[in-house]
């Protein structure tokens, strides 16, 4: 059966929970959620010195 694509993670990290294509994997909490609950980091403006803040739920890319 075809499931959503799984992403590769670090060697020591547990395998991600597989999600049906209707959902996305939230890396921080390690479970599947509606994709709209995930926020991708905004691109950093030119010349900015600090990275964009990360939100509670980050998608696994």
């Amino acid at each position: 059966m075809r499931r959503g694509p799984r992403s590769l993670r670090g060697r020591d990290a547990p395998a991600p929970t597989p999600c049906v294509p209707a959902e996305c994997f939230a890396l921080l909490v390690r479970h599947c959620v509606a994709c709209g609950l995930l926020r991708t980091p905004r691109p950093k403006p030119a010349g900015a010195s600090s990275p964009a803040p990360r939100t509670a739920l980050q998608p696994q890319e």
Partner: antibody, heavy 118, light 113 residues
Framework: EVKLVESGGGLVQPGGSLRLSCAIS????????MSWVRQPPGKALEWLGF??????????EYNPSVKGRFTISRDNSQSIFYLQMNTLRAEDSATYYC?????????WGQGTTVTVSA | DIVMSQSPSSLAVSVGEKVTMSCKSS????????????LAWYQQKPGQSPKLLIY???TRESGVPDRFTGSGSGTDFTLTISSVKAEDLAVYYC?????????FGGGTKLEIK
């Protein structure tokens, strides 16, 4: 072939409870999310919630409109999926459908009718 | 909750005509990481349960005739039937699954002249 068959509908008094069942065949039950959707007579569809698959610990999501009154569960050994409905109101009268979730709500049962009336 | 608005609420067409129906969401359904729009279209024929036609706004479900086409992105979506057949008599619903609770539009009823 995927087959979903709902049962358990009927007439119930306001304040009463009812448990709907969805019998599943044609696919591995533990590997899919299962959802409930309802449709009042002549009206649009309303998503009630779903239960995730084994890999996701059978966790649930609910529509806030029914959260606390409705509970979704599953008996994987019998390939049955349930909707427990408590404190029923007249506005809960509808045809209730179970659906398999993959890309969206991919496959639907034929529905079972619930009427809440004194 | 995301509000889904469909228009028109009903339309009557002759067999062979092209039909377009609209679905608008109160917020974007586009997930930027994968460029998918989390929108589906369903067909509900009289006395039957809904059937999935289109998912991710434009991907046709297996077995769905190619006269059905979904398009759009963000908040504005369209379902087009290129040449209507008598068997297309139904109510068509759009639904977002971008976030919880999943929500449906009010439907567009397609009648055949």
């Amino acid at each position: 072939e995927v087959k979903l068959v709902e049962s358990g509908g009927g007439l119930v008094q306001p304040g009463g409870s009812l448990r709907l069942s969805c019998a599943i065949s044609g696919f591995t039950v533990t590997a899919y999310y299962m959802s409930w959707v309802r449709q009042p007579p002549g009206k649009a569809l309303e998503w009630l919630g779903f239960i995730r698959d084994k890999a996701n610990g059978y966790t649930t999501e609910y529509n806030p409109s029914v959260k606390g009154r409705f509970t979704i569960s599953r008996d994987n050994s019998q390939s049955i999926f349930y909707l427990q409905m408590n404190t029923l109101r007249a506005e809960d009268s509808a045809t209730y459908y179970c659906a398999q979730v993959r890309r969206a709500l991919d496959y639907w049962g034929q529905g079972t009718t619930v009427t809440v009336s004194a | 909750d995301i509000v889904m608005s469909q228009s028109p609420s009903s339309l009557a067409v002759s067999v062979g005509e092209k039909v377009t129906m609209s679905c608008k969401s109160s917020q974007s359904l586009l997930y930027s990481s994968n460029q998918n729009n989390y929108l589906a279209w369903y067909q509900q024929k009289p006395g039957q349960s809904p059937k999935l036609l289109i998912y991710w706004a434009s991907t046709r479900e297996s077995g769905v005739p190619d006269r059905f086409t979904g398009s759009g992105s963000g908040t504005d979506f369209t379902l087009t039937i290129s040449s209507v057949k008598a068997e297309d008599l139904a109510v068509y619903y759009c639904q977002q699954y971008y976030t919880y609770p999943y929500t449906f539009g009010g439907g567009t009823k397609l009648e055949i002249k």
